[in-house]
Interface confidence: low
């Protein structure tokens, strides 16, 4: 999987993380997980192996199987949302995943992140700094 090493967005704003995967994993379950340790992180949301979007509380996930990209959106960001997260793909045997650090800038603080032009409180990240974790 490929994804951004870190993303940042303002408090009360939203962020979108896009994670890319290789051909062959299209119909597998994709998930978004919180926690420093890969093996014990808390899965916040997951797909059902289809392109249907899922939403749970303030987090949503959508898989675009044609582009082999799944997108996670976190809304209404709070300071305590700042943590290490993982994009993952479930498979029989060890899952695949890549780590993403989420940074939440306190309200009023200057953000160095380029925002979406249509919503100054939403930052979209497609992984300009990519890491591989196959």
């Amino acid at each position: 999987i490929q994804g951004p090493e870190s993303v940042r967005a303002p408090e009360q704003g939203s962020l979108t993380v896009q994670c890319h995967y290789k051909q062959g994993w299209e119909t597998y379950i994709k998930w978004w997980c919180r926690g420093v340790r890969w093996d014990t992180c808390k899965i916040l949301i997951e797909t059902r192996g289809s392109e249907q979007g899922e939403k749970s509380d303030r987090v949503s996930i959508k898989d675009n199987q044609k582009d082999r990209t799944f997108t996670v959106t976190m809304e209404g960001l709070r300071r305590d949302d700042a943590d290490v997260y993982w994009c993952g793909i479930e498979r029989r045997g060890p899952d695949l995943g890549t780590q993403v650090k989420v940074i939440v800038d306190p309200e009023g603080a200057a953000s160095t992140t380029a925002s979406s032009p249509t919503n100054s409180n939403m930052a979209v990240f497609i992984g300009s700094h990519k890491r591989n974790h196959y």
Epitope: I43, E46, Q52, G53, E54, K55, E90
Partner: antibody, heavy 113, light 107 residues
């Protein structure tokens, strides 16, 4: 053949918690999600959420967020649904269902002071 | 949340009748629609998934159709064991939601 066997009926007081178990057999436990659906007396069906037994991932209906916890024990092919802060409106039959195609027999939870 | 409505809420029919139950979703759910049968004191039983696919072991007199927001469950020739309550359910997005049910009674 696929079988889902649930724990027995429970009577609880308001404010208490209940934990219902669902033991699966006859298929590969980690390959299918397990859902929990409840049905109040004389009422319709209400989806509570699911657990993915392979990853442990859960999705809960917003209505139950913060009150429900679904867990699994892969060593015994059992899933659990715990509902806390019980109130009289939680009196219902609680069903586990494998991807909604096979269902347990149901567990009646009665909340009464 | 996606709201599911069913009509009629109840109906009386005779053995051999053709019975049609409709289900409407509050938004487009493509074909992510399932139908269940439930008898008193028993767990629901999946009849139709994906709007029109017959679940294994279910008699062919049951059929489903529709896409988008409007769906239909048809029992081509009602049998004595078919008197029950029928529910539709969407699995397009969470929370998955059920219709209020249609009770099929003996005339």
């Amino acid at each position: 053949q696929v079988q889902l066997v649930q724990s027995g009926a429970e009577v609880k007081k308001p404010g208490a918690s209940v934990k219902v178990s669902c033991k699966a057999s006859g298929y590969t436990f980690t390959n299918y999600r397990m859902h929990w659906v409840r049905q109040a007396p004389g009422q319709g069906l209400e989806w509570m959420g699911w657990i993915n037994p392979n990853s442990g991932g859960t999705i809960y209906a917003q209505k139950f967020q913060g009150r429900v916890t679904m867990t699994r024990d892969t060593s015994t092919s059992t899933v659990y649904m715990e509902l806390s802060s019980l109130r009289s409106e939680d009196t219902a039959v609680y069903y586990c269902a494998r991807d909604l195609d096979y269902w347990g027999q149901g567990t009646l939870v009665t909340v009464s002071s | 949340d996606i709201q599911m409505t069913q009509s009629p809420s109840s109906l009386s029919a005779s053995v051999g009748d053709r019975v049609t139950i409709t289900c409407q979703a509050s938004q487009d759910i493509s074909n992510y629609l399932n139908w269940y049968q439930q008898k008193p004191g028993k767990a629901p039983k999946l009849l139709i998934y994906g709007a029109s696919s017959l679940q294994s072991g279910v008699p062919s007199r049951f059929s489903g159709s529709g896409s988008g927001t409007d769906f239909t469950l048809t029992i081509s020739s009602l049998q004595p064991e078919d008197f029950a309550t029928y529910y539709c359910q969407q699995s397009y997005s969470t929370p998955w939601t059920f219709g209020p049910g249609t009770k099929v009674e003996i005339k």
